[in-house]
Interface confidence: medium
């Protein structure tokens, strides 16, 4: 927890942020909570960003005050107005851009006092991988595909049966730039697979880690995938 010391005037209140990541082109959330106030009109929320002259967003007297908002955020920010009264100052950021990455400050004023906390926001691209059997290949082959990643991730294969085995010699990974020239499609092929085994394709960069599993038996194929953001930690 970061308490807003160092601001002269009223008492300090506790403001809490959570470091998070935004997926380019999608909407993101910059998380911030504070000790709530009973009166909405007494709450002021300010979002600032390092390297931006002017505010990212301001909410006060029950509404947005955006007349002096920096151009790069115009039309892209909103708070959850109905949740401010219960202490939610989180900022919704529409159409996340690579340049939105950086350090933000959530600055809160209420009748109880003032406080602030910083938040590290990373941006990139991440997506769920899908693993399929490649029936076009001459030998038993698995194909792992994920449509959007940035920065370029690493891809590692693993298997339940051969735990600890290094599959780099029997796999081939390629990265294909998508049409917007930032994100890339990840394709990794694993050769010489055996049935009655579960294989995992793990894709990871400094923002996210995603895994696609496939279980191949003589009678069926089962798939499962999940994605985890790596830098979500509270301040």
């Amino acid at each position: 927890l970061i308490i807003g010391f160092g601001i002269s005037g009223r008492h300090s209140i506790t403001v809490t942020t959570v470091a998070s990541a935004g997926n380019i082109g999608e909407d993101g959330i910059l998380s911030c909570t504070f000790e709530p106030d009973i009166k909405l009109s007494d709450i002021v929320i300010q979002w600032l960003k390092e390297g931006v002259l002017g505010l990212v967003h301001e909410f006060k007297e029950g509404k947005d005050e955006l007349s002096e908002q920096d151009e790069m955020f115009r039309g892209r920010t909103a708070v959850f107005a109905d949740q401010v009264i219960v202490g939610n100052a989180s900022l919704r950021l529409k159409n996340v851009q690579l340049t939105d990455a950086g350090t933000y400050k959530c600055y809160i004023i209420t009748s109880k006092g003032k406080g602030n906390a910083n938040l590290e926001y990373k941006t990139g691209a991440f997506s769920m991988p899908e693993v399929n059997v490649d029936y076009n290949a001459s030998s038993e082959t698995l194909r792992c595909e994920a449509p959007r990643w940035f920065p370029q991730p690493t891809v590692v294969w693993a298997s339940q049966v051969d735990q600890g085995a290094n599959f780099s010699e029997v796999s081939n990974t390629s990265f294909e730039l998508n049409s917007e020239n930032v994100t890339m499609k990840v394709v990794s092929v694993l050769y010489n697979v055996t049935i009655n085994n579960t294989y995992s394709c793990m894709i990871e960069n400094d923002i996210a880690k995603a895994t696609g599993d496939i279980k191949v038996t003589e009678s069926e194929i089962k798939r499962r995938s999940h994605l985890q953001l790596l830098n979500s930690k509270a301040s």
Partner: antibody, heavy 126, light 113 residues
């Protein structure tokens, strides 16, 4: 376009308190996304930041003057004020109020001054 | 505190000629995480308050003529007036807003030769 106007006595005796007020017109001091500050300029010399205030009352002071400075705000009058105690001849200067367009670096709120008052000369002399 | 040192203290330039003012900071005002220089330039005409010209070392404030340009990075910065006009006679100040307290240079007086 925002306008700022300083007012207060032009002559203050040594050891007394210098008091100035800045009135902001064209726009409300409490409904904009700006901070407000005081800067001074001794005759024929450079500029020195004194301190900054937000409409809520949050203040940031120059460490070199912190023990003697108080900046306050009166949103009902659209004004903010400067008090500088125990003045000496070294405090003789043109005092400006200004609007601060804020940014943040390493967690500290700071910025550039985009609109200034005309300034008022305060002479410290007995 | 970061000390800002300007050079020269004054310069005289013919109308239509280029004027160049330098500003050096005692420590870098370049923030590596966003690659921005936290430096501004102001113009102060006789009997008037300062006027913001440039911020982020090279971004012109709205309404400032394009004959004014800023350059430099880290600790060394330059304000250039590409073609001096009579109305440019003034004292010019640099200011760092990288760390608190914000500090100004001592000023450079620009006159017509």
């Amino acid at each position: 376009q925002v306008q700022l106007q300083e007012s207060g006595p032009g002559l203050v005796k040594p050891s007394e308190t210098l008091s100035l007020t800045c009135t902001v017109s064209t726009g409300s001091i409490s409904s904009s996304s700006y901070y407000w500050g005081w800067i001074r300029q001794p005759p024929g010399k450079g500029l020195e930041w004194i301190g900054t205030i937000y409409f809520s009352g949050s203040t940031y002071y120059n460490p070199s003057l912190k023990s003697r400075v108080t900046i306050s705000v009166d949103t009902s009058k659209n004004q903010f004020s400067l008090k500088l105690t125990s003045v000496t001849a070294a405090d003789t200067a043109v005092y400006y109020c200004a609007r601060l367009r804020v940014t943040m670096v390493r967690g500290v709120i700071i910025g550039v001054f985009d609109f200034w008052g005309q300034g008022t000369l305060v002479t410290v002399s007995s | 505190d970061i000390v800002m040192t300007q050079s020269p203290d004054s310069l005289a330039v013919s109308l239509g000629e280029r004027a160049t003012i330098n500003c050096k900071s005692s420590q870098s005002v370049l923030y590596s995480s966003n690659n921005k220089n936290y430096l501004a330039w102001y113009q102060q005409k006789p009997g008037q308050p300062p006027k913001l010209l440039i911020y982020w070392a090279s971004t012109r404030e709205s309404g400032v003529p394009d004959r004014f340009s800023g350059s430099g990075s880290g600790t060394d910065f330059t304000l250039t007036i590409s073609s001096l006009q009579a109305e440019d006679v003034a004292v010019y100040y640099c200011q760092q807003y990288y760390s608190t307290p914000p500090t100004f240079g001592q000023g450079t007086k620009v006159e017509i030769k």
